[in-house]
């Protein structure tokens, strides 16, 4: 009788994670007597996957009827495959003895596991940045196999080109991770913008995974200030307004200064939102000019999102108004330090 051969017909098998892998093996002879064993890897560190003779292998089942001696099919099925199962599997015939001795091995079947990448996670800079600045976004996805993967960046549907991507590890591994950093130049209109990281992989069947970051969490649009005055009903009263325009985020504190002295401080509350996502706010002061002998320098000082204050001043010419003594008949103090100035916001 011809000497036994161990035939593993498949050089490689590819299986999706979670599925079962069938590894084929047949022998050409019933002799010598002895068990078949399956190993992952070769050499002294090889891992026993299945032993016909003994042991408990809960994930492994034999494909053929193993209770008939004439059965020469020793194919196995391994259930619930994970990337950690990847490797080369050898079907090995042993000769019965003490100890059992390896008689002949198959050529091996390489099992590759197709594992989906995790949902991409996009993270932006720790601190907010202002328009015209360049900020970095990172995108990470893990646990995929095989190694080949495509990553693209978009800003509002427009593909970005300034990015760098690494897939780790460089050598063979059961699964891989991708890390990409994209550079994005901010504009004043980016409050509603999104940065998207898109990952395409063979396991996703043409339906890429996306991770997003809202630039609203990254951008700071500093306000523009405009201080104006217009006369009010009474000749001796002037309404001074501070228009705070196009700022983001909403966190803003405004202080009125009269000749350098704090008159009133308020926090932006009832703001109006612009189409681009920025906010506008207005604060006003009602100034009784008859109470002043000299010109008044009114300053609108704004502290936005914890940044250094910006301010805009307005010189109120007192000489242009007749001074009427005793005309300061304020009935209430609306937060000002002196009874000759009234304020509000809107």
């Amino acid at each position: 009788e011809e000497e036994l051969q161990v035939i593993q017909p498949d050089k490689s098998v590819s299986v999706a994670a979670g599925e079962s892998a069938i590894l084929h093996c047949t022998v050409t002879s019933l002799i010598p007597v002895g068990p078949i064993q399956w190993f992952r890897g070769a050499g002294p560190a090889r891992e026993l996957i299945y032993n016909q003779k003994e042991g408990h292998f809960p994930r492994v089942t034999t494909v053929s009827e193993s209770t008939k001696r004439e059965n020469m099919d020793f194919s196995i099925s391994i259930s619930n495959i994970t990337p950690a199962d990847a490797g080369t599997y050898y079907c090995v015939k042993f000769r019965k003895g003490s100890p059992d001795t390896e008689f002949k091995s198959g050529a091996g079947t390489e099992l590759s596991v197709r594992a989906k990448p995790s949902a991409p996670v996009v993270s932006g800079p720790a601190a907010r940045a202002t328009p015209q600045h360049t900020v970095s976004f990172t995108c990470e996805s893990h646990g995929f196999s095989p190694r080949d993967i495509t990553l693209k960046w978009f800003k509002n549907g427009n593909e970005l080109s300034d990015f760098q991507t690494n897939v780790d590890p460089v050598g063979e591994s059961v699964s891989y991770s991708i890390h990409s950093t994209a550079k994005v130049v901010l504009t004043r209109e980016d409050v509603h913008s999104q940065v998207i990281c898109e990952v395409a992989h063979v396991t996703l069947q043409g339906d890429p995974l996306r991770g997003t970051a809202n630039l609203s969490e990254t951008i700071r649009v500093p306000p523009t200030l405009e201080v104006t005055q217009q006369p009010v009903r009474a000749e001796n009263q002037v309404n001074v307004t501070c228009q705070v325009r196009k700022f983001y985020p909403q966190r803003l504190q405004l202080t009125w200064l009269e000749n350098g002295n704090v008159s009133r401080t308020e926090t932006a509350s009832t703001v109006t939102e612009n189409k681009d996502g920025t906010y506008n706010w207005m604060s006003w002061l009602l100034v009784n000019v008859s109470a002043h002998r000299d010109d008044v320098k009114l300053t609108c000082q704004v502290e936005h999102d914890g940044q250094p204050a910006v301010s805009k001043s307005h010189d109120l010419k007192v000489s242009a108004h007749p001074k009427e003594q005793g005309s300061n008949t304020a009935a209430e103090n609306t937060g000002s330090n002196e009874r000759n100035i009234y304020g509000g916001s809107g």
């Epitope: 002879s29 007597v33 008939k68 001696r69 003895g97 100890p99």
Partner: antibody, heavy 118, light 107 residues
Framework: EVQLVESGGGLVQPGGSLRLSCAAS????????MHWVRQAPGKGLEWVSA???????YYTGSVKGRFTISRENAKNSLYLQMNSLRASDTAVYYC????????????WGQGTMVTVSS | DIQMTQSPSSLSASVGDRVTITCRAS??????LAWFQQKPGKAPKSLIY???SLHSGVPSKFSGSGSGTDFTLTISSLQPEDFATYYC?????????FGQGTKLEIK
């Protein structure tokens, strides 16, 4: 149903011959190592002979040169030709099937009695 | 030839008892050891192979262990039908050899 049925036993004089048969059913005999085991009256079990799937044969020392194991695939049968019989060969002879991969005995026949006496 | 020695040669026990029979090989036989049960006037019945694997249809009250030279057969809770003679056998190499048997009797 997997079954082994022995026949051919009986009374024979010392120096005589006997041929035991074992008819297998429910499996292909040629795919298994097959054995003969005997048990002298009131004694324990003794392995006698085996034939492998390739036709290789094995014997215990006391029967070498006197007994011959064989099989006939067409009849799905196993045989034990016993020559130069001795009184010490008196026993119940069992036909036994070796296991699927390790030759562990799994199926036994009911046995046939061989008595060697003058 | 490999010698197989069983102990004890006979054993008296009661229904419900747990009993252990030992078998020693004169040299390392890996785990190619089988256990058989035989009742008077009947053919032996295969119980265990490769020291600890139960043949199909054998109740789980029978268990085997061991490797190399020392082996045991344990019956966890004796029933009336378990009183019989038990044999061990090495089948690592020819000539296959049996132990002399252990007769399990009702006390």
């Amino acid at each position: 149903e997997v079954q082994l049925v022995e026949s051919g036993g009986g009374l024979v004089q010392p120096g005589g011959s006997l041929r035991l048969s074992c008819a297998a059913s429910g499996f292909t005999l040629s795919s298994y190592d097959m054995h003969w085991v005997r048990q002298a009256p009131g004694k324990g079990l003794e392995w006698v002979s085996a034939i492998g799937t390739a036709g290789d044969t094995y014997y215990t020392g006391s029967v070498k040169g006197r007994f011959t194991i064989s099989r006939e695939n067409a009849k799905n049968s196993l045989y034990l030709q016993m020559n130069s019989l001795r009184a010490s060969d008196t026993a119940v002879y069992y036909c036994v099937r070796g296991g699927v991969w390790d030759d562990a005995f799994d199926i036994w026949g009911q046995g046939t009695m061989v008595t060697v006496s003058s | 030839d490999i010698q197989m020695t069983q102990s004890p040669s006979s054993l008296s026990a009661s229904v419900g008892d747990r009993v252990t029979i030992t078998c020693r090989a004169s040299q390392d036989i890996n785990n190619y050891l089988a256990w058989f049960q035989q009742k008077p006037g009947k053919a032996p019945k295969s119980l265990i192979y490769t020291a600890s694997s139960l043949h199909s249809g054998v109740p789980s009250k029978f268990s085997g262990s061991g490797s190399g030279t020392d082996f045991t057969l344990t019956i966890s809770s004796l029933q009336p039908e378990d009183f019989a003679t038990y044999y061990c056998q090495q089948y690592v190499s020819y000539p296959y050899t049996f132990g002399q048997g252990t007769k399990l009797e009702i006390k």
